[in-house]
């Protein structure tokens, strides 16, 4: 990119507009799942933070080579995970950063809930949430 | 090729206003951010702000509050700033830039 | 406000010597790959020159003598062999956060 680029107006408030879906996902271990971010225009670079709990701060999230990836293109910006595990449970935002601003905007979060339990705790949480 | 040109040197006496002005050509105008530095005599560069040169709306550094307005003529490609109640402490180069591009700079005196 | 310090204040160099600018910034300016911070040179009477855009990308025109590197808060302008046109002043700044700031400046001077 040229020097330049980085002083571009935002298009209107473009960069503020941030459609993330799905909105949730549940899938069984091992699977693979895709999250979107859809942006007005491309005034930003995108980036993704993660939560596990509810009450948590997202932080960024760390790619796992291989196994998580990202790619953005002029209007869409994805994450993939690959072989999903128990200890990827929890929201994934889409965060955009506009070009010329310190301006920060972020998606309404993607949940992932990782399916087959682990555990007889975990057998045992999940039909007390069913009930 | 980009050109940024800015008006002349002022000198103005305090309490008074000045209005210095930016042409841009070369480029789209409402492409890109404008942005305003100032430069006291013998001292360092300090960013005062910038205006969205498609909405019109400007934002302001701290110390650039007040009496500092940016404005647009975007029929004529040109950024403006304007200085009201001048001080002493205003004498200084101002410059336009975006990027790379920057204006030659404006120098406003402010002397009785 | 993010503050940026410059050093050394000056630096008093022969031509053919190596020049190192430092740049520390109070907090980040990265933003996921990149890091917002471009170095400047100025010269009496003269506006500001870009020299180097996020952190390591030399602008269109300059000479490959200048070169920057560094991320985070650390930040280096590195002319190789200095030149008898390169003795002047040289200012970083950082754009991922408003207000835009830009260090005190470094006067690279004949020794």
């Known amino acids: 990119a040229r020097s330049e680029d980085r002083y571009r107006n935002p298009k209107g408030s473009a960069c503020s507009r941030i459609w993330q879906s799905p909105r949730f996902i549940a899938r069984k271990r091992g699977f693979t799942v895709k999250m979107h971010c859809y942006m007005n225009s491309a005034s930003g670079n995108v980036s993704w933070l993660w939560k596990q709990e509810m009450d948590e701060n997202p932080q960024q999230l760390k790619l796992e080579k291989g196994r998580m990836e990202e790619s953005q293109n002029e209007s869409l910006a994805t994450l993939t995970i690959q072989g999903i595990r128990f200890e990827d449970n929890g929201i994934y935002f889409c965060q955009q950063k506009c070009n010329n601003t310190s301006e920060v905007y972020q998606g309404c979060g993607t949940e992932l809930r990782v399916m087959g339990f682990s555990t007889l705790a975990q057998l045992k949480q999940r039909n007390t949430l069913k009930d | 090729q980009v050109q940024l040109v800015q008006s002349g040197s002022e000198l103005k006496k305090p309490g008074a206003s000045v209005k210095v002005s930016c042409k841009a050509s070369?480029?789209?105008?409402?492409?890109?951010?404008m942005h305003w530095v100032r430069q006291a005599p013998g001292q360092g560069l300090e960013w005062m702000g910038w205006i969205n040169t498609e909405t019109g709306e400007p934002s302001y550094a701290d110390d650039f509050k007040g009496r500092f307005v940016f404005s647009l003529d975007t029929s004529v490609s040109t950024a403006y700033l304007q200085i009201s109640s001048l001080k002493a402490e205003d004498t200084a180069v101002y410059y336009c830039?975006?990027?790379?591009?920057w204006g030659q700079g404006t120098l406003v005196t402010v002397s009785s | 406000e993010i503050v940026l310090t410059q050093s050394p204040a000056t630096l008093s160099l022969s031509p053919g010597e190596r020049a190192t600018l430092s740049c520390k910034a109070s907090q980040s300016v990265d933003h996921d790959v990149d890091s917002y911070m471009d170095w400047y040179q100025q010269k009496p009477g003269q506006a500001p020159r870009l020299l180097i855009y996020s952190a390591s990308n030399l602008e269109s025109g300059i000479p490959a003598r200048f070169s920057g590197s560094g991320s985070g808060t650390d930040f280096t302008l590195t002319i190789s062999s200095l030149e008898p046109e390169d003795f002047a002043v040289y200012y970083c700044q950082q754009i991922n956060e408003y207000p835009y700031t830009f260090g005190g400046g470094t006067k690279v001077e004949i020794k």
């Open positions: 070369g480029y789209t105008f409402t492409d890109y951010s």
């Open positions: 830039y975006y990027g790379p591009y």
